[in-house]
């Protein structure tokens, strides 16, 4: 949805009594107007168990839910209950279009609420709000990857979440790099996982009424050592005109720290190969992978002498890999011919 659009669920007509749970994505700053029941007999709107007041930035008024400008803390579950009964007329979850735009992921959205003019509706044990986001139970990830486990839940009162690893309370204090607990997103994030992170991660969601739990099984796969892998087709054969600039690209993948060299094949005494059978080369550039732009060889203002074979050579503690490409340099275009060429189209 564009930020300029307004989110409207439906006009304020008689509600369906078999209202399905809905999920709406709303862009930050976007106005929201949702209706529930006829205007004169509209239902009461609740957010996460608290009834919305008829005034304010987020308000429930005559069956309408109105948000002047959607903010990250407005995300959550909204219920519309029929007046004088507990019949659910609307049941929907508003989610932020880009949840990462939240200024502070760990901030509890409840802290933004003013509870003074809200009424509570019946207590409810915790339940999963997005079980489809929890369907991948078994995770097998290479060492060094980032892992994110989510257990989005709701209830009344709003439940708390805590995490266990192999049945023990888990705060990540013994983990290099620690962990990120994003309570607003009901998530646990571990960056640069290592084999010691393997195990069963349990999210335990609790409130005064009850508790639910879910287990994620994490396996960390140790990367098998191998010599550098060079992306196929790079460097690529290139044709350039005298005086132009050329870039040759070499993409290197390596778990162990790689060392990269750019070589140009040369001829000595009319021969391209030495007595040992190896080609004669000139080292043009050498560096480690973390050096800036080591994977690119820049050739400025090329001349005919720059034509030839170029090799990207990458090595690590396990072995060497290399791939080559040819640079063809064409003579500079004849300016007389270039200028005359457009005229040729207009002659018989």
């Amino acid at each position: 949805l564009e930020a300029s659009e307004e989110v409207e669920l439906e006009p304020c007509l008689a509600p369906s009594l078999e209202q399905q749970e809905q999920e709406l994505t709303v862009a930050l700053g976007q106005p929201v107007r949702l209706c529930c029941g006829r205007a004169e007999r509209g239902g009461h709107w609740y957010k996460e168990g608290s009834r919305l007041a008829p005034a304010g930035r987020v308000r429930g008024w005559r069956g309408r839910l109105e948000i002047a400008s959607f903010l990250p803390e407005d995300a959550g579950r909204y219920l519309c209950l029929a007046r004088g009964s507990m019949i659910v007329l609307q049941n929907l979850t508003l989610i932020t279009g880009d949840s990462l735009t939240s200024s502070n992921d760990d901030e509890d959205p409840k802290s933004h609420r003013d509870p003074s003019n809200r009424h509570s509706y019946p207590q409810q044990a915790p339940y999963w709000t997005h079980p489809q986001r929890m369907e991948k139970k078994l995770h097998a990830v290479p060492a060094g990857n980032t892992v994110k486990f989510r257990c989005p839940a709701a209830g009344n009162p709003t439940p708390t979440i805590r995490w266990l690893k192999d049945g023990q309370a888990f705060h990540g204090e013994n983990r290099i790099g620690g962990i990120r607990l994003r309570h607003q997103h009901w998530s646990l994030v571990m960056e640069s996982v290592v084999p010691s992170d393997r195990g069963t991660y349990t999210c335990l969601v609790e409130n005064a009424v009850g508790s639910i739990r879910y287990n994620y099984l994490l396996d960390v796969l140790e990367r098998s050592p191998h010599r550098p892998i060079l992306q196929a087709g790079l460097p690529a054969n290139t044709t350039a005109v005298v005086g132009s600039d050329v870039e040759l690209l070499c993409k290197v993948y390596s778990d162990a720290q790689p060392h990269i060299q750019w070589l140009k094949h040369i001829v000595i005494n009319g021969s391209s190969f030495g007595a040992d059978g190896f080609p004669y080369v000139q080292v043009l550039k050498t560096a480690d992978i973390n050096s800036s732009e080591v994977e690119v060889l820049y050739l400025r203002n090329v001349s005919a002498e720059d034509a030839g074979e170029y090799t990207c050579l990458a090595g690590n503690s396990i072995g060497l890999s290399y791939q080559s490409a040819w640079l063809t340099v064409l003579p500079e275009e004849d300016p007389t011919w270039t200028a005359a060429a457009p005229e040729a189209r207009y002659t018989d």
Partner: antibody, heavy 118, light 112 residues
């Protein structure tokens, strides 16, 4: 072709031991969780144990905990189930199965029969 | 006794639609996805439905699965004689001493 082939079943006395093997082929064995499931004659399926791809995490049914050990040798693409202190109620066809990320058993072996009897 | 409850038997005539139910609890079906397996006589089980309602390639669209709350069901439409088999539901269980896998007791489907 993706395939699992169990072996090692046979007749064993109560209190005895047996080691089952499951040879895998046709997929990257080391990346997959694997599991053992058994079926007593004329009965339903019963989950026995599971192991992560690296072998670093293992899971067991209460009925076999402390008696059975699941393990794997990724260099040989083989899954094992070491069964100790066997009881008559352990008599069953034992299947090995590959486990998908949502937790389903998508590939099964043909099974190997273990009979515990005196 | 199985953690997941299935009717021991079901039957139908060719072309009919048959439904097999599977009932569990919050820690298994209520929290985890449900898988269904078909076991033809004398053979190993075969994955029929995974993640509540997904069919692996090669499984006919006559087979469908659904889940609601702590229950799941397998529906077979256009019943055929070759569908005569045992059907099992299964799910991971995340109760206090989990995680582990639980199966239903199985339903023997007879095609009349």
């Amino acid at each position: 072709e993706v395939q699992l082939l169990e072996s090692g079943g046979g007749l064993v006395q109560p209190g005895g031991s047996l080691r089952l093997s499951c040879a895998a082929s046709g997929f990257t064995f080391s990346r997959n969780y694997m599991s053992w499931v058994r079926q007593a004659p004329g009965k339903g399926l019963e989950w026995v144990s599971a192991i992560s791809g690296s072998g670093g995490s293992t899971y067991y049914a209460d009925s076999v905990k402390g008696r059975f050990t699941i393990s794997r040798d990724n260099s040989k693409n083989t899954l094992y189930l070491q069964m100790n202190s066997l009881r008559a109620e352990d008599t069953a066809v034992y299947y090995c199965a590959r486990v998908t990320s949502p937790g389903a058993f998508d590939i099964w072996g043909q099974g190997t029969l273990v009979t515990v009897s005196s | 006794q199985s953690v997941l409850t299935q009717p021991p038997s079901a039957s139908g005539t060719p072309g009919q639609r048959v439904t097999i139910s599977c009932s569990g609890g919050t820690s298994n079906i209520g929290t985890n996805t449900v898988n269904w397996y078909q076991q033809l006589p004398g053979t190993a089980p075969k994955l029929l439905i995974y993640r509540n309602n997904q069919r692996p390639s090669g499984v006919p669209d006559r087979f469908s699965g659904s889940k609601s709350g702590t229950s799941s069901s397998l529906a077979i439409s256009g019943l055929r004689s070759e569908d005569e088999a045992d059907y099992y539901c299964a799910a991971w269980d995340d109760s206090l001493n989990g995680p582990y896998v639980v199966f239903g007791g199985g339903t023997k489907l007879t095609v009349l």
